[in-house]
């Protein structure tokens, strides 16, 4: 499955929403910076691609989720907001077109569903983190920079994909 | 390869105007802040402020706030540390180095190789 | 602003021998400090960084430990390339402060 040139324009559009949606001067947060155990490993490039359409599928499920709760709402300007899940339901959409298509439909393998959980564990320590910090301005800047990072990340390995074929 | 590459040594004369630069390659450069540390001969490290290139974002530390302007041009991924009107006192090494902001990565893990600036009469 | 103090501002040592050096913070900083080396004429040089992780590529002999207000960086055995000055900085709050210094001498 090709996911369409359009998919990783999308991605570098919601790296530029993430961006914009910032709120404070992010200088007065340094003190609310914290480990989330980013699970850069489930994204290496000895993945095959069956392997990682799921994965990839699962981060972009979680930031939408992240970003779709009541706080997300109050935290961030409405109209950036909606932009960003525009663009993520788009890209859920590329990648959902490419199981359908039959990429991961075999036995998922083992180390798939490890990945998977991998994901979801590291954004239930962003979520407990936000609940910690009562879901305050700093806290949810903090975690708009992770999820840059990550996100960034998961986009490389969709980039490195691409140039493999 | 991450690099900081900073503009070469510099000679003024008291009252003149002076700008350095900044060059970062090999990583996304609006991604990490960058802070200016001042050495003076035979003295410790300085911290003297720091930028946000994603929208130029500026703090400075209170001995420096006023005296020295940091700004950033992010379509040349280059940071500069100006002043208006040089002093002798203003003689040192500058260095410039990256931070990762607000994410969880080794602070300020690349520096610039230091800008020596002589102001002499 | 964060005063950080260390102790000693020099020392002299031999290779082989385990320095200690130490940095205090006027207030707690969490772990948001960081430890520098800088040899003459040289930028400075990250070595350990959020107080206890060791920065890539840096020798295993380097280790750092502490949180709050006293923080300690240990080189186990002093080889002929650690001779240099070391530096403590708080990354907690703006405006980041450094320590004076810890010049590693030969004895």
């Known amino acids: 499955c090709d996911l369409p040139q359009t998919h990783s324009l999308g991605s570098r559009r919601t790296l530029m929403l993430l961006a914009q949606m910032r709120r404070i001067s992010l200088f007065s947060c340094l003190k609310d910076r914290h480990d989330f155990g980013f699970p850069q490993e489930e994204f290496g490039n000895q993945f095959q691609k069956a392997e990682t359409i799921p994965v990839l599928h699962e981060m972009i499920q979680q930031i939408f989720n992240l970003f779709s709760t009541k706080d997300s709402s109050a935290a961030w300007d409405e109209t950036l907001l909606d932009k960003f899940y525009t663009e993520l339901y788009q890209q859920l959409n590329d990648l959902e077109a490419c199981v359908i298509q039959g990429v991961g439909v075999t036995e998922t393998p083992l180390m798939k569903e490890d990945s998977i959980l991998a994901v979801r564990k590291y954004f239930q320590r962003i979520t407990l983190y936000l609940k910690e910090k009562k879901y305050s301005p700093c806290a949810w800047e903090v975690v708009r920079a992770e999820i840059m990072r990550s996100f960034s990340l998961s986009t490389n390995l969709q980039e490195s994909l691409r140039s493999k074929e | 390869e991450v690099q900081l590459v900073q503009s070469g040594a510099e000679v003024k004369k008291p009252g003149e105007s002076l700008k350095i630069s900044c060059k970062g390659s090999?990583?996304?450069?609006?991604?990490?802040?960058i802070g200016w540390v001042r050495q003076m001969p035979g003295k410790g490290l300085e911290w003297m402020g720091i930028i946000d290139p994603s929208d130029s974002d500026t703090a400075y530390s209170p001995s420096f706030q006023g005296q020295v302007t940091i700004s950033a041009d992010k379509s040349i991924s280059t940071a500069y540390l100006q002043w208006s009107s040089l002093k002798a006192s203003d003689t040192a090494m500058y260095y410039c180095?990256?931070?990762?902001?607000?994410?969880?990565?080794?602070?300020?893990?690349?520096w610039g190789q230091g800008t020596l600036v002589t102001v002499s009469s | 602003d964060i005063q950080m103090t260390q102790s000693p501002s020099s020392l002299s040592a031999s290779v082989g021998d385990r320095v200690t050096i130490t940095c205090r913070a006027s207030?707690?900083?969490?772990?948001?400090l960081n430890w520098y080396q800088q040899k003459p004429g040289k930028a400075p040089k990250l070595l350990i960084y959020f107080a206890s992780s060791l920065q890539s590529g840096v020798p295993s002999r380097f280790s750092g430990s502490g949180s709050g207000t006293d923080f300690t960086l240990t080189i186990s055995s002093l080889q002929p390339e650690d001779f240099a000055t070391y530096y403590c900085?708080?990354?907690?709050?703006?405006?980041?402060?450094f320590g004076q210094g810890t010049k590693v001498e030969i004895k």
């Open positions: 207030q707690s900083i969490s772990k948001f």
């Open positions: 180095a990256r931070h990762p902001g607000l994410n969880w990565a080794p602070d300020f893990d690349y």
């Open positions: 900085q708080q990354s907690n709050t703006l405006p980041f402060t």
């Open positions: 090999g990583y996304s450069f609006t991604s990490y802040w």
